[in-house]
């Protein structure tokens, strides 16, 4: 007899993994054998489609590699012509044992600054992620979080930060490992121990000793008046992350020399500094008879400020008068290549005439000062607001009582051209006289483009730098 | 009663061919999907093939995609395999077995007495 | 392919012994899941279909148990007639793959 088809297995709710078979049974009773359909989400599924399989007479339909976009509600439908069409529903839920999507990846972070471990996951259920440090579990804190998306942030990256690190995406299904990737903390070169300045006799031996961390080890360089270190020996040696240099020197003449401290973090270094001084004892002490002699300028510093075969006076207080006062002027003009256009030949013609002072020869062989009026046309119009800084320095005892030649001449004491003429020495390079004087530039246009340069800092009376950091 | 009964087994070069059938007896034989299933000498059960009872799905295993090719009369309550480019381990005794599919999931509940194939050169 | 895995391979038992041989689904395969007894020069024999029901004329010592991707068949008090090779087969998929077997041989 004929029979109404009737589904004696309603379709259940599947759950399969992604490539993995996922089958709906629908059972039907009728007479005579019944056509069976199936659709997903109200879309006829083609049965000769080849990712799936009909069986038992479409009463079995399985999916033979599960797919993400399977998801979805299946209803299988039989008629036989007898009564009307029956159906039934079941939804398939297509689970997904964890994968990592996006997996961390090696790290250099400089110290102090905010590193991002990615670890982007995939699953259904959604995967919990954590983080495992070495071979034990990552602890949350204020400055070490797992993100929503799974990444791991680290804020204000310390030291012992650096290490190895995997993330663990786990739900019902399994658990996912990320391969171990490296956090490494790079830390900026730092002077651990500056060298110390030393005022020594002729002759001595002097070891400067500087010492510097960072990660990377930095290296060091000893630089001497500006230049690379061209005698003394240098000794290194490293330990725990700690380079410690040692220079020895053979002291004929004072110098300032400056241990840099550099580092590389990628295509950028950092660096860190400090100097200290040497100078001789005896040296620069304030004679109060003219110890000198007159002798025409020889040096190459002063060469294109002082007049061709002028008559300098050399200040035999100095083991090597010519030498020693050259240093002194070339360490000075050193700081002046950061000064305004406008100042800087000012500038330059007041210290070559301040240092080397012209000399009147005689039976005692007398240095002759600048006049006043020059020194103020330097003060007050040309170098108006380096002048203010070097004052400002001066008096806060930032250059040493020793180095009076580079600290600024106080204008008011030098002699005035008006009160003897051949009292003072004058500048030929400013033009200084009356007529002429409304050529000087205003006080506005004497501002210079560039802050006068940080001359080193000292603590009491040695001359000493503190540590200074850069990234170049 | 149901009977399946296999025929068509023997002795046959690698590279050969044979027609394996199954004549069914004592069930409605077009009703029924049927499968081939064979046991190698001292080995497990391996599933080979299976029709619909309409003819209208056929699955085959991987390790004969391709040279066996399954097919049913259901005038004539046959079932048949042919098998072509035969290899060594294609030696077996081969089953026909019914799917029975009603309350439950598919399962084979009627099997033959099996006929061995041979393939040796 | 679903693979199936029986174990354990083989067991020595005595009669009137409980026999419990396992399968394991390398997926799950819900209920899908039968097993057969074959003796030496005979077809196989449906014994549990549907992983707990038992196929008529099956002596009710046979049991089965499990689903998604483990199950087992119990022997509750072995008889000299079940020393037989075991094998479990899944449905779920249209490759209906067997177990190894397990063969269950006299102590």
């Known amino acids: 007899l004929p029979k109404a088809p009737v589904i004696t297995t309603p379709l259940e709710t599947v759950d399969a993994l992604v490539e993995e078979v996922a089958t709906f049974m629908c059972a039907v009773e009728s007479y005579p054998q019944p056509e069976i359909s199936w659709t997903r989400n109200k879309i006829l599924i083609k049965l000769f489609d080849t990712r799936y399989s009909i069986r038992e007479n479409g009463q079995l339909l399985t999916i033979l590699s599960v797919e993400d976009s399977d998801d979805g509600i299946y209803c299988c439908t039989a008629n036989n012509g007898v009564g009307g069409a029956v159906e039934s529903c079941g939804a398939l839920q297509v689970k997904m044992k964890p994968k990592i999507t996006r997996p961390p990846i090696n790290v250099k972070i400089i110290e102090g600054l905010k590193a991002v471990l990615p670890c982007t996951t995939m699953g259904n259920p959604k995967p919990s992620v954590s983080w495992i440090k070495g071979d034990s579990p990552l602890r949350e804190n204020s400055r070490i979080a797992v993100l929503e998306s799974g990444s791991l942030r680290i804020h204000n990256v310390q030291k012992e930060d650096a290490g190895q690190y995997r993330c663990v995406a786990k739900n019902s299904l399994g658990t996912a490992y990320s391969k171990v990737v490296k956090l490494e903390v790079e830390v900026f070169a730092r002077i651990l121990r500056a060298p110390e300045s030393h005022n020594v006799t002729f002759g001595s031996f002097v070891t400067l000793h500087c010492t510097a961390t960072g990660i990377p080890v930095p290296t060091i360089t000893w630089i001497e008046n500006g230049n690379a270190v061209s005698s003394g020996s240098i000794q290194e040696s490293v330990k725990d992350r700690v380079i410690d240099s040692r220079l020895q020197l053979f002291i004929t003449k004072p110098g300032l020399y400056t241990c840099i401290a550099t580092n590389k973090h990628g295509e950028k270094f950092s660096t860190a500094k400090a100097a200290a001084t040497i100078s001789i004892a005896e040296w620069s002490k304030p004679q109060k008879d003219n110890k000198g002699y007159c002798a025409q300028y020889r040096g190459e510093v002063c060469n294109a400020v002082l007049a061709k075969d002028a008559l300098v006076f050399l200040n035999t207080s100095y083991a090597d008068p010519e030498e020693a006062q050259e240093l002194l002027v070339h360490t000075a003009w050193n700081e002046l290549k950061v000064v305004s256009p406008v100042c800087r030949p000012a500038a330059e013609a007041l210290l070559c005439n301040h240092i080397f002072q012209e000399c009147s020869p005689g039976v005692v062989p007398t240095p002759i000062p600048i006049c006043r009026e020059y020194c103020l046309a330097v003060k007050e119009l040309f170098c108006a607001k380096e002048w203010l800084v070097m004052e400002e320095k001066t008096h806060r005892g930032l250059y040493r009582s020793e180095m009076h030649l580079l600290s600024v001449p106080e204008c008011s004491k030098l002699p005035s051209m008006h009160w003897d003429p051949t009292a003072c020495a004058r500048l030929p390079h400013l033009d200084y006289n009356k007529e002429n004087l409304k050529t000087f530039p205003p006080m506005t246009s004497s501002k210079p483009s560039v802050d006068i340069p940080n001359l080193p800092s000292s603590s009491s009376s040695s001359f000493s730098v503190s540590p200074t950091y850069s990234m170049t | 009663e149901v009977q399946l009964v296999e025929s068509g087994g023997g002795l046959v070069k690698p590279g050969g061919s044979l027609r394996l059938s199954c004549a069914a007896s004592?069930?409605?034989?077009?009703?029924?999907?049927m499968h081939w299933v064979r046991q190698a000498p001292g080995k497990g059960l391996e599933w080979v093939s299976s029709?619909?009872?309409?003819?209208?799905?056929?699955y085959y295993a991987d390790s004969v995609k391709g040279r066996f090719t399954i097919s049913r009369d259901n005038a004539k309550n046959s079932l048949y395999l042919q098998m072509n480019s035969l290899r060594a381990e294609d030696t077996a005794v081969y089953y026909c077995?019914?799917?029975?599919?009603?309350?439950?999931?598919?399962?084979?509940?009627?099997w033959g007495q099996g006929t061995l194939v041979t393939v040796s050169s | 392919d679903i693979q199936m895995t029986q174990s354990p391979s083989s067991l020595s038992a005595s009669v009137g012994d409980r026999v419990t041989i396992t399968c394991r689904a390398s997926?799950?395969?819900?209920?899908?899941l039968n097993w057969y007894q074959q003796k030496p020069g005979k077809a196989p024999k449906l014994l549990i279909y549907?992983?707990?029901n038992l196929q008529s004329g099956v002596p009710s010592r046979f049991s089965g148990s499990g689903s998604g991707t483990d199950f087992t068949l119990t022997i509750s008090s072995l008889q000299p007639e079940d020393f037989a090779t075991y094998y479990c087969?899944?449905?779920?998929?249209?490759?209906?793959?067997f177990g190894q077997g397990t063969k269950l041989e006299i102590k």
């Open positions: 004592g069930f409605t034989f077009s009703t029924y999907t």
């Open positions: 549907g992983a707990s």
């Open positions: 029709i619909s009872s309409r003819s209208a799905y056929k």
């Open positions: 077995a019914r799917d029975f599919f009603q309350l439950g999931p598919p399962r084979f509940d009627s």
């Open positions: 997926q799950r395969i819900s209920s899908f």
């Open positions: 087969q899944q449905s779920y998929s249209p490759s209906y793959t």
